[in-house]
C-alpha cells in the first residue's frame, strides 16, 4: 500500500564492548499499533537482512547478529515504520558501524592501599556475549592506555588526573588522609574510538596505612 | 548535534529562589552525568551539583548543600536546579554539563570532564 507512513526521523548505533544497540527516533503521531521492521546490511555482503519485522521499542539489540564486528568491514542498519499494510521508506544509519564507533569502558576498578599509595587493578569488560578468544586486550592489543582522575570526597569537584600505560598503577596520596574516590577512562593510543568514564571506586585512608619512617 | 539549553537565570534578592532548567536535543544516551556549574567574574569554573540520569543519585557542593536540589525530567529531557536562599555570592553565570555513562557498567557523578556544555544562563543576586 505505498509508502504513506513518515520514516523514522534518525538511526544510529549506541554500542560498548560487545554491547551493539540500535536506536531510532519514533515517527510523528505514531499510533498504537505503529512498530518498527529493523534490518541490517554487512559490509561486503551487499544484501539487506531482516532482523525484526515489528518492533514497538525505539531500540534494538544487535549483539548477536554483529559478533564479527571486530574482525569485519563493519555494518549499516535501516529502519522503517510499519502500521497495517502500511509503511514508511526505509531510514539508514548514516556512517558505517564498525570497530570505530565502539565506545570503549573498563569493567571495574579495584582499589587497595599499601604504605600510603592507593594500588589500583583495572579489570577490562569481560561481557558473556563475546565469543570466547575475542577478549578486550585481544581486540586491543596495543597501545592500550587509561585516564586516571582521583578526588578527596565529600563535596569536591576538584580531579586530580593522571595518565597510564598498563591496568595496574598507583597513585601517591601525599600523606592526605580522608576518603578518595578514582575514576577511569580507557583510550587506545592508535585509534579514535571514544572512551567512558568508570563507576567511581572510593578507598578510605587512614593514619594507619603509613609506615613511620625516622 | 548535541545541544543543551539552559534557561531560568535573573535577578533576585538575597533570600529569594530561582528554578534552572536545562533541556538536552539531540543526545541519545540514556545514562548520563548531568552537572551544573557556574563560574563568577574572575573566578575558576565550579562544580555545584550533579545527577546520574541512569540512577537519580545525586552531588552537591559544599557550598550549596541544603539551598539547591538538582532533579530531572527523563520524558523532557531536561535537568532542573532548584535554587533556594540565595546568597550574593551564588552570582555567577551557570551552565549545563552533560557526560555520557556506560549502559552495561553504569557510572558515577560528578564525572571528572564533561564532553557536552551548555551557553550559560545568569545569576545575580543582590543584598
Known amino acids: 500500500h505505498g509508502t504513506e507512513l513518515p520514516s523514522p526521523p534518525s538511526v544510529w548505533f549506541e554500542a560498548e564492548f560487545f554491547h551493539h544497540i540500535l536506536h531510532w527516533t519514533p515517527i510523528p503521531n505514531q499510533s498504537e499499533s505503529t512498530c518498527y521492521e529493523v534490518a541490517l546490511l554487512r559490509y561486503g555482503i551487499e544484501s539487506w537482512n531482516s532482523i525484526s519485522n515489528c518492533s514497538q521499542t525505539l531500540s534494538y539489540d544487535l549483539t548477536a547478529v554483529t559478533l564479527d564486528l571486530y574482525h569485519s568491514n563493519g555494518y549499516r542498519a535501516r529502519v522503517r515504520a510499519v502500521d497495517g499494510s502500511r509503511h514508511s521508506n526505509w531510514t539508514v544509519t548514516n556512517t558505517r558501524f564498525s570497530v570505530d564507533e565502539v565506545t570503549l569502558t573498563v569493567g571495574s576498578v579495584n582499589l587497595e592501599i599499601h604504605n600510603g599509595f592507593i594500588l589500583g587493578k583495572i579489570q577490562l569488560p569481560r561481557p558473556k556475549m563475546a565469543p570466547a578468544n575475542d577478549t578486550y586486550e585481544s581486540i586491543f592489543s596495543h597501545f592500550r592506555e587509561y585516564e586516571i582522575a582521583i578526588r578527596k570526597v565529600p563535596g569536591n569537584f576538584t580531579f586530580t588526573h593522571k595518565k597510564v600505560k598498563h591496568e595496574n598503577f598507583s597513585l601517591l596520596t601525599s600523606g592526605e588522609v580522608g576518603e578518595f574516590c578514582v575514576q577511569v577512562k580507557p583510550s587506545v593510543a592508535s585509534r579514535s574510538n571514544k572512551g567512558m568514564w568508570s563507576k567511581e571506586e572510593c578507598i578510605s585512608l587512614t593514619r594507619q596505612y603509613f609506615t613511620v619512617t625516622n | 548535534q548535541v545541544q543543551l539549553q539552559e534557561s531560568g537565570g535573573g535577578s533576585v534578592q538575597a533570600g529569594g529562589s530561582l528554578r534552572l532548567s536545562c533541556t538536552v536535543s539531540?543526545?541519545?544516551?540514556?545514562?548520563?552525568?548531568m552537572g551544573w556549574f557556574r563560574q563568577a567574574p574572575g573566578k575558576e569554573r565550579e562544580g555545584v551539583a550533579t545527577?546520574?540520569?541512569?540512577?537519580?543519585?545525586?552531588y552537591y557542593a559544599d557550598s550549596v548543600k541544603g539551598r539547591f536540589t538538582i532533579s530531572q525530567d527523563n520524558a523532557k529531557n531536561t535537568v532542573y536546579l532548584q535554587m533556594n536562599n540565595l546568597k550574593p555570592e551564588d552570582t555567577a553565570m551557570y551552565y549545563c554539563?552533560?557526560?555520557?555513562?556506560?549502559?552495561?557498567?553504569?557510572?558515577?557523578?560528578?564525572?571528572?570532564?564533561?564532553?557536552?556544555w551548555g551557553q550559560g544562563t545568569q545569576v545575580t543576586v543582590s543584598s
Open positions: 554539563a552533560a557526560e555520557p555513562l556506560s549502559r552495561v557498567y553504569g557510572g558515577s557523578c560528578p564525572t571528572p570532564t564533561f564532553d557536552y
Open positions: 539531540g543526545y541519545t544516551y540514556s545514562s548520563n552525568c
Open positions: 545527577i546520574y540520569t541512569g540512577g537519580g543519585n545525586t
